[in-house]
């Protein structure tokens, strides 16, 4: 059910493209295509190409994206396009000018002098933005989200966007300055991963990051399963970057025992992050027999 045909406008198309990109990434990283049939990979890649082509129809002259061409461009959506396209660039041919044009727009048009990224065109499909939907600490969570997207595009865009390293540093400094006052476990997790990507998740931020975990295995807010899966996935990625392999197993087991395999309303971010994190886990911790994920992928019928 994760491999679906993308369709719809600028936001819906990304909702549809997400699970297929992350499913192919996960199966590539974990070398599990034999289970599903290697020929399915090519079919999935065709769907990703279709999603990519369709998304270009919603690229505005500024290289930013919105649900419709007559709407103001969205910082969050543009950063998400950067994130998904950066991952898809390992799978299909992505025009680097398209990707890096979006990166340039984020930096030049949406980053304030203090490093914060601002949103002037909120997405219509609020269910696709995951834990960021809770408006509390929105400046930090949006800045962390964009910073992570910029880091993921860095290899492709550094040569084309001279201001990229400076932009990343500025955003990182803002997150550092805000981190100790954060209250939402979701923000602590996403911002913690952003800092980890910059090798800055160290004391006192590291203590705050680890102590925010409930029972040392999850970054949780009451009655928010999807947000908690998303947040804990960010935290797992941070722990893997830190090479804190002693703290990782209970986090992986918690994610695994949620029996969350993606799909469904409001699942875009949780799906993307849980499979990105578990793929990274299985790459970084090769003896991963303790991850007993019963994952199934179904291609759409023609």
């Amino acid at each position: 059910h994760l491999i679906v045909t993308p369709a719809g406008a600028g936001e819906q198309n990304m909702i549809g493209m997400t699970p297929t990109v992350i499913a192919v990434h996960y199966l590539d990283q974990t070398e599990q295509w034999e289970k599903f049939g290697i020929e399915k990979r090519q079919e999935a890649l065709e769907l990703i190409k279709k999603g990519y082509t369709q998304q270009l129809a919603f690229k505005q002259p500024s290289s930013a994206y919105a649900a419709f061409n007559n709407r103001p461009p969205s910082t969050w959506l543009t950063a998400y396009v950067v994130k998904v396209f950066s991952l898809a660039a390992n799978l299909i041919a992505i025009d680097s000018h398209v990707l890096c044009g979006a990166v340039k727009w984020l930096i030049l048009e949406k980053q304030k002098p203090d490093g914060v990224f601002q949103e002037d065109g909120p997405v219509i499909h609020q269910e696709m933005i995951g834990g960021f939907r809770n408006a509390k600490e929105a400046d930090v969570s949006l800045t962390a989200f964009v910073l992570i997207a910029l880091q993921e595009a860095r290899d492709i865009c550094e040569g084309q966007v001279n201001s990229l390293p400076g932009s990343i540093n500025k955003a990182g400094e803002y997150i550092e300055a805000s981190y100790m006052n954060l209250q939402r476990p979701y923000t602590v997790a996403i911002a913690g991963y952003a800092l980890a990507l910059m090798n800055k998740l160290e004391e006192p931020y590291l203590g705050k990051f680890l102590n925010t975990a409930k029972d040392r295995n999850r970054w949780e807010e009451p009655d928010q399963q999807l947000y908690n899966v998303e947040a804990t996935s960010y935290a797992l990625l941070a722990l893997l970057l830190l090479k804190d392999f002693d703290s990782v197993p209970p986090v992986v087991r918690w994610l695994n025992e949620q029996r969350y395999y993606g799909g469904g309303y409001g699942s875009t971010q949780a799906t993307f992050m849980v499979f990105q994190a578990l793929a990274q886990y299985q790459t970084d911790v090769p003896d991963h027999k303790d991850l007993n994920m019963d994952v199934s992928f179904h291609l759409p019928s023609r």
Epitope: D215, R216, E220, P249, P250, D287, D290
Partner: antibody, heavy 120, light 108 residues
Framework: QSLEESGGRLVTPGTPLTLTCTVS????????MAWVRQAPGKGLEYIGW??????TYYASWAKGRFTISKTSSTTVDLKMTSLTTEDTATYFC????????????????WGPGTLVTVSS | DGVMTQTPSSTSAAVGGTVTIKCQAS??????LSWYQQKPGQPPKLLIY???KLASGVPSRFKGSRSGTEYTLAISGVQREDAATYYC??????????FGAGTNVEIK
């Protein structure tokens, strides 16, 4: 930090029974709690555990007949149904070491145990 | 078949000697293993968690190690107060978790 089990007694087969673990010196809103039992002269047997949010995890053999629940910030119950003579044992509660998953970080401290005797 | 196979069921050692207890997991459990000491009439006491980490207040003569799916508790320089039954607890998943059968250690 200390724990104490209560509610153990002599019951007849088929009778339901609820044991209570009362903690002092810490709050269950930040700690995990496990239940383990030990039949007379036998080894330890893991039953299950509850996390600080109230989610429960059970050994496969215990599912359905045993229910762990948090009844306050200082008490956790173990409800047992359809008791048989095989359930005669001392029942222990134990906190997750350092507030973590007790199956990974270990169980510490433990209560002294409460004896349940099932006999007709 | 159980999750954990513990050997031996009993052993003895002289004061100052070494005791070695093993637990074999039925499949990979990585670091999901802890060791407990229990004396008659008392609850168990945590000795080792995460396969090799010493619990707070436990003497350094207790040492946990792992090789593949075999886990070892070694007590070097055994003291009289170490006479007890020792158990391992291994976990494949939350619903597939079990103690070993126990090892009774006698000090001569």
């Amino acid at each position: 930090q200390s724990l104490e089990e209560s509610g153990g007694r002599l019951v007849t087969p088929g009778t339901p029974l609820t044991l209570t673990c009362t903690v002092s010196g810490f709050s269950l809103s930040r700690y995990t709690m496990a239940w383990v039992r030990q039949a007379p002269g036998k080894g330890l047997e893991y039953i299950g555990w509850i996390d600080s949010s109230g989610s429960t995890y059970y050994a496969s053999w215990a599912k359905g007949r045993f229910t762990i629940s948090k009844t306050s910030s200082t008490t956790v119950d173990l409800k047992m149904t359809s008791l048989t003579t095989e359930d005669t044992a001392t029942y222990f509660c134990a906190s997750g070491n350092d507030g973590g998953d007790p199956l990974y970080y270990g169980m510490d401290p433990w209560g002294p145990g409460t004896l349940v005797t099932v006999s007709s | 078949d159980g999750v954990m196979t513990q050997t031996p069921s009993s052993t003895s050692a002289a004061v100052g000697g070494t005791v070695t207890i093993k637990c074999q997991a039925s499949q990979s459990i990585r670091s999901w293993l802890s060791w407990y000491q229990q004396k008659p009439g008392q609850p168990p006491k945590l000795l080792i968690y995460e396969a090799s980490k010493l619990a707070s207040g436990v003497p350094s003569r207790f040492k946990g190690s792992r090789s593949g799916t075999e886990y070892t508790l070694a007590i070097s320089g055994v003291q009289r107060e170490d006479a007890a039954t020792y158990y391992c607890l291994g976990s494949i998943a939350s619903d597939d978790t079990a103690f070993g059968a126990g090892t009774n250690v006698e000090i001569k």
